[in-house]
């Protein structure tokens, strides 16, 4: 099993630009989670989906952030417009 697959591995952008992160969960998993990790704030849950439906997006109250899961094998996290403070490591995870 390839595990969770994210792309891109690295992203450098200018402030104000749109950024789209992509995730392919493990096949058969019905829950998908997007996290953000920074030195200052630690690991934060942004949003999670169950059966493609967003359950809790309270970790991303800024409407610059949006996430979609159009099907069981794909999700995107979009930041528009991006800000310097969005610099972080973004993790996607999936579970049964």
């Amino acid at each position: 099993d390839a595990g969770v697959i994210q792309s891109p591995r690295h992203e450098v952008t200018e402030m104000g630009q749109e950024v789209t992160l992509r995730c392919k969960p493990i096949s058969g998993h019905n829950s998908l989670f997007w996290y953000r990790q920074t030195m200052m704030r630690g690991l934060e849950l942004l949003i999670y989906f169950n059966n493609n439906v967003p359950i809790d997006d309270s970790g991303m109250p800024e409407d610059r952030f949006s996430a979609k899961m159009p099907n069981a094998s794909f999700s995107t996290l979009k930041i528009q417009p991006s800000e310097p403070r969005d610099s972080a490591v973004y993790f996607c995870a999936s579970s049964l």
Epitope: R41, G42, D56, G59, E62, D63
Partner: antibody, heavy 117, light 106 residues
Framework: EVQLVESGGGLVQPGGSLRLSCAAS????????MHWVRQAPGKGLEWVSY????????YYADTLKGRFTISRDNSKNTLYLQMNSLRAEDTAVYYC??????????WGQGTTVTVSS | DNQLTQSPSFLSASVGDRVTITCRAS?????IYWYQQKPGKAPKLLIY???NLAPGVPSRFSGSGSGNEYTLTISSLQPEDFATYYC?????????FGQGTKLEIK
């Protein structure tokens, strides 16, 4: 029916502290982010703070950072605002509000904080 | 911080009038949200994501706009609409409000 009931307001001297509470009912509290908003007498609305469902994501108004602390206890369905080093300009009605529809879809009735000597 | 400026700050109108309130942002926002507040009461969500009516809000209310400029329109004022209206942005923290527009009976 969604209900938010604030409490803990009152008269406090400058430099003093207060802890406001917001008791939630009628919805699954642990699934929603929550806000505090305040309104000084005769003035407009001022956003104070936000906390996510699991308390990991927290935001404050720049001017209040360091004096105010937002927290929640999901087992008690309660939101809190700890306010320290209070000033006269903190005098206001304080509202809690639920995050919904990307905004604040339900509000409490407010609790009044008066900072005066 | 993104400053929101509402115009006008005060508006006198009559029952049946069509009124428009404008909210201008100092920096572009993705959406604007509108609230109504009556004296001594908590604010009430009217419009979310710029143009979506909150549950129970009459269809005479509508919202539009993009970028830096947004509007709230009441197509035919009813007596219960006389109140103060606020816009708010959630594009970037801090989540600022406009200063308010007080709608009074002429």
């Amino acid at each position: 029916e969604v209900q938010l009931v604030e409490s803990g307001g009152g008269l406090v001297q400058p430099g003093g502290s207060l802890r406001l509470s917001c008791a939630a009912s009628g919805f699954t509290f642990s699934n929603f982010g929550m806000h505090w908003v305040r309104q000084a007498p005769g003035k407009g609305l001022e956003w104070v703070s936000y906390i996510s469902s699991g308390s990991k994501t927290i935001y404050y108004a720049d001017t209040l950072k360091g004096r105010f602390t937002i927290s929640r206890d999901n087992s008690k369905n309660t939101l809190y605002l700890q306010m320290n080093s209070l000033r006269a300009e903190d005098t206001a009605v304080y509202y809690c509000a639920r995050r919904g529809e990307g905004a604040m879809d339900y509000w409490g009735q407010g609790t009044t904080v008066t900072v005066s000597s | 911080d993104n400053q929101l400026t509402q115009s006008p700050s005060f508006l006198s109108a009559s029952v049946g009038d069509r009124v428009t309130i404008t909210c201008r942002a100092s920096s572009s926002v993705n959406y604007i949200y509108w609230y109504q507040q009556k004296p001594g009461k908590a604010p009430k969500l009217l419009i979310y994501y710029t143009s979506n009516l909150a549950p129970g809000v009459p269809s005479r209310f509508s919202g539009s706009g993009s970028g830096n400029e947004y509007t709230l329109t009441i197509s035919s004022l009813q007596p219960e609409d006389f109140a103060t209206y606020y816009c708010q942005q959630f594009t970037s923290s801090p989540f600022t409000f406009g200063q308010g527009t007080k709608l009074e009976i002429k």
